[in-house]
Amino acid sequence: GSERICCPINWVEYEGSCYWFSSSVKPWTEADKYCQLENAHLVVVTSWEEQRFVQQHMGPLNTWIGLTDQNGPWKWVDGTDYETGFKNWRPGQPDDWYGHGLGGGEDCAHFTTDGHWNDDVCRRPYRWVCETELGKAN
């Protein structure tokens, strides 16, 4: 018979994708690189269902997702179209705030403690989630 493809150890399967949930923190760019080295990408949230799934696993923690406007327009790291896709910004966000005094604006998106998205300084260290297609992760 045909063998069932599974996610690697420590990864969680959901709707044909595999997810890995960090327990440490990194800046957005380092988190992005970490996922790439695992043959994955930072999580791309495409529906309420996926949003709830990730939230349930991460709990109420600031968590980087694969959405950035460092190059101007908001872009998902896997090329999913931002404009037509699912969005779950916290009210009043994104605001590209400069008042934090860290230099520059806020160019990377993360889950806030209640799951809504916020844009923040990419250098801040937050937890992160990697995602890949079933069978692709290292």
Epitope: D69, Q70, W74, Y98, G103, G104
Partner: antibody, heavy 113, light 107 residues
Framework: QVQLVQSGAEVKTPGASVKVSCRAS????????MHWVRQVPGQGLEWMGW????????NYTQKFQGRVTMTRDTSISTAYMELSRLRSDDTAVYYC??????WGQGTLVTVSS | DIQMTQSPSSRSASIGERVTITCRAS??????LAWIQQKPGTAPKSLIY???SLQSGVSSRFSGSGFGTDFTITISSVQREDFATYYC?????????FGHGTKVDIK
């Protein structure tokens, strides 16, 4: 494609107010702050401030504080910049701009008695 | 406020020549610097952001470099359509500020 279309040229007398509009299309209006920049004829560019279309929050440079008001109407994806107590040295082209690259065509405001 | 000083204020160049414009910030701005091109009677056009990243659709003749306080934009081989005024702009913090501009014209 992204477009920022501004209202037409205005002629005002000193002491009056002007309200310039900037209609956005081709992107999610609430996902990006709208900046306003002006250019006095023959001079360089001068940043005036921005508005966050989500909640109407704004940040104005000190030079224009008290005279400028930036607002928006999300239902029609339009940002507005109102400048009051106009003086002759406010004669300039006013531009709206989106982060890193998209600019309106400019609106010439002439202040003359 | 952060002051942005551009040099030279004007530059005459022949087609095909390499042109370099510099911009100095009065304090460190990391790489939060943009370069903007403006031709007479038209709206500004963004060329470069984050000091060295080319805006999509901009010719690879243009390149930017620098970090901290000193930045440059280079046109490797200037073409007729490149004759314009170039501004640097910092977006490290409010208020955003521009250089006074460098006019590049035909020799």
């Amino acid at each position: 494609q992204v477009q920022l279309v501004q209202s037409g040229a205005e002629v005002k007398t000193p002491g009056a107010s002007v309200k310039v509009s900037c209609r956005a299309s081709g992107y999610t209006f609430t996902s990006y702050n709208m900046h306003w920049v002006r250019q006095v004829p023959g001079q360089g560019l001068e940043w005036m401030g921005w508005i966050n279309p989500n909640n109407g929050g704004s940040n104005y440079t000190q030079k224009f504080q008290g005279r400028v008001t930036m607002t928006r109407d999300t239902s029609i994806s339009t940002a507005y910049m109102e400048l009051s107590r106009l003086r002759s040295d406010d004669t300039a082209v006013y531009y709206c701009a989106r982060k890193f690259g998209d600019w309106g065509q400019g609106t010439l405001v002439t202040v003359s008695s | 406020d952060i002051q942005m000083t551009q040099s030279p204020s004007s530059r005459s160049a022949s087609i095909g020549e390499r042109v370099t414009i510099t911009c100095r910030a009065s304090q460190g701005i990391s790489n939060y610097l943009a370069w903007i091109q403006q031709k007479p009677g038209t709206a500004p056009k963004s060329l470069i952001y984050a000091a060295s990243s080319l805006q999509s659709g901009v010719s690879s003749r243009f390149s930017g470099s620098g970090f901290g306080t000193d930045f440059t934009i280079t046109i490797s081989s200037v073409q007729r359509e490149d004759f314009a005024t170039y501004y640097c702009q910092q977006y490290n913090g409010y208020p955003f500020t521009f250089g006074h501009g460098t006019k590049v014209d035909i020799k």
